[in-house]
């Protein structure tokens, strides 16, 4: 069965996905969809990486890892309950039939009312979007961005300072996925499978 | 219009090889997975192979692996299906068909070649 | 493998009536079905895709539905034309398998 991710509408959700590549810069092709993981492909590809770059992408699917070194978790921005569902990170390694395929179960919760707003620092502040010009973008033209190195010691540091929000399981949840030395539990919310 | 023609087939020994191949035309070919499926005279339907837009990926019904190979050449918008070894109970009709596209979605064999004849008989 | 099983193996039907053709499959393959029609001496015809839509200039009386692993194909108010075998096929796991085929003749 899927492994099951949480987020509440409003959120950024995050669903991990990696691998190792080669060399450096010896990448592989990576599809995101939304719905299982067919035999081929991604069902409805949101987004899509080739030997280089991001090459296709769709609003609010982005990838805040660098995917130059593996990381291809994608980042859903501002979900709705209508996000919820399974979404499949095909890592497209070429061979006779050597894809990687991982089914990761969404389960989007409505907001909780929350009595007064807590100053937290923005997501999106501190894991930039990726930005990029190749490939078979949809309408909308976007221009070139850099990715910033954020480090595990970064990652640790924002969630401290996050801790009481919901967003910092996420970003706890980020460093432990980086780390991946085992598979990991946070919470009863979230259960986390290091696929590579 | 997107058209699938596939090479003609024959009668070979048992044995030896055969190459098919299969011209694209109507629409752009490595933007598709494509597949050859073949089919025993007055009998279903069987999957033989898959190849992703680029050759890179090949995909093949694990008992026709060590002898059937897929490749596409891009440039000439041709795919092809390399048969060694053949056996008698691959004679049948060999058809192409284009699969699934650069941006999903659409899972099915949208199109299909006329397809070739190839009996293997002594 | 995923083994698709197709009933029934054969339907006698006249012109006008309604028939259901149903494919279970072995294990869950979500909606990545498809339904193909194949007339005799012709080349298979994609009807329907992802279990229920319907595939570019494919009559209206023709519909998919089911997910999962229960399956069926619909023609509404039969036609000469529609006469001939029809295959379902699951696009989730590998090997592509196909089922065994339903041929629909004209009682």
């Known amino acids: 069965s899927e492994v099951e991710y949480r987020a509440e509408v409003g959120q950024n959700a995050y669903l991990p996905c990696f691998y190792t590549p080669a060399a450096p810069g010896n990448l592989v092709p990576v599809c995101w969809g939304k719905g299982a993981c067919p035999v081929f492909e991604c069902g409805n590809v949101v987004l899509r990486t080739d030997e280089r770059d991001v090459n296709y992408w769709t609003s609010r699917y982005w990838l805040n890892g660098d995917f130059r070194k593996g990381d291809v978790s994608l980042t859903i921005e501002n979900v709705t309950l209508a996000d919820s569902g399974i979404y499949c990170c095909r890592i497209q390694i070429p061979g006779i039939m050597n894809d990687e395929k991982f089914n990761l179960k969404l389960v989007i919760k409505p907001a909780k009312v929350t009595p007064a707003p807590t100053r937290q620092r923005d997501f999106t502040a501190a894991f930039p979007r990726m930005l990029t010009t190749r490939g078979h973008g949809p309408a909308e033209t976007q221009t070139l961005g850099s990715l910033p190195d954020i480090n595990l010691t970064q990652i640790s540091t924002l969630a401290n300072e996050l801790r009481d929000s919901r967003l910092a399981n996420d970003l706890r949840d980020s460093g432990a996925t980086i780390r991946g030395s085992s598979d990991y539990k946070d919470d009863d919310d979230k259960h986390h499978h290091h696929h590579h | 219009e997107v058209k699938l023609v596939e090479s003609e087939g024959g009668l070979v020994q048992p044995g030896s090889s055969m190459k098919l191949s299969c011209t694209a035309s109507g629409f752009t070919f490595s933007d598709y997975y494509m597949a050859w499926v073949r089919q025993v005279p007055e009998k279903g339907l069987e999957w033989v192979a898959n190849?992703?837009?680029?050759?890179?990926?090949?995909y093949y019904l694990d008992s026709l692996k060590s002898r059937f190979i897929i490749s596409r050449d891009n440039a000439k918008n041709i795919l092809y299906l390399q048969m060694n070894s053949l056996k008698s109970d691959d004679t049948a009709t060999y058809y192409c068909?284009?699969?699934?596209?650069?941006?999903?979605?659409?899972?099915?064999?949208?199109?299909w070649g006329q397809g070739t004849l190839v009996t293997v008989s002594a | 493998d995923i083994q698709m099983t197709q009933s029934p193996a054969s339907l006698s039907a006249s012109v006008g009536e309604t028939v259901t053709i149903t494919c279970r499959a072995s294990d869950n393959i979500y909606s990545y079905l498809a339904w193909y029609q194949q007339k005799q001496g012709k080349s298979p015809q994609l009807l329907v895709y992802?279990?229920?839509t319907l595939a570019e200039g494919v009559p209206s009386r023709f519909s998919g539905s089911g997910s999962g692993t229960q399956f069926s194909l619909k023609i509404n108010s039969l036609q000469p034309e529609d006469f001939g075998s029809y295959y379902c096929q699951q696009h989730y796991g590998s090997p592509l398998t196909f089922g065994a085929g339903t041929k629909l003749e004209l009682k």
């Open positions: 992802n279990a229920k």
């Open positions: 190849i992703n837009y680029d050759g890179s990926s090949t």
């Open positions: 068909a284009r699969d699934v596209g650069y941006y999903g979605g659409n899972y099915g064999f949208a199109y």
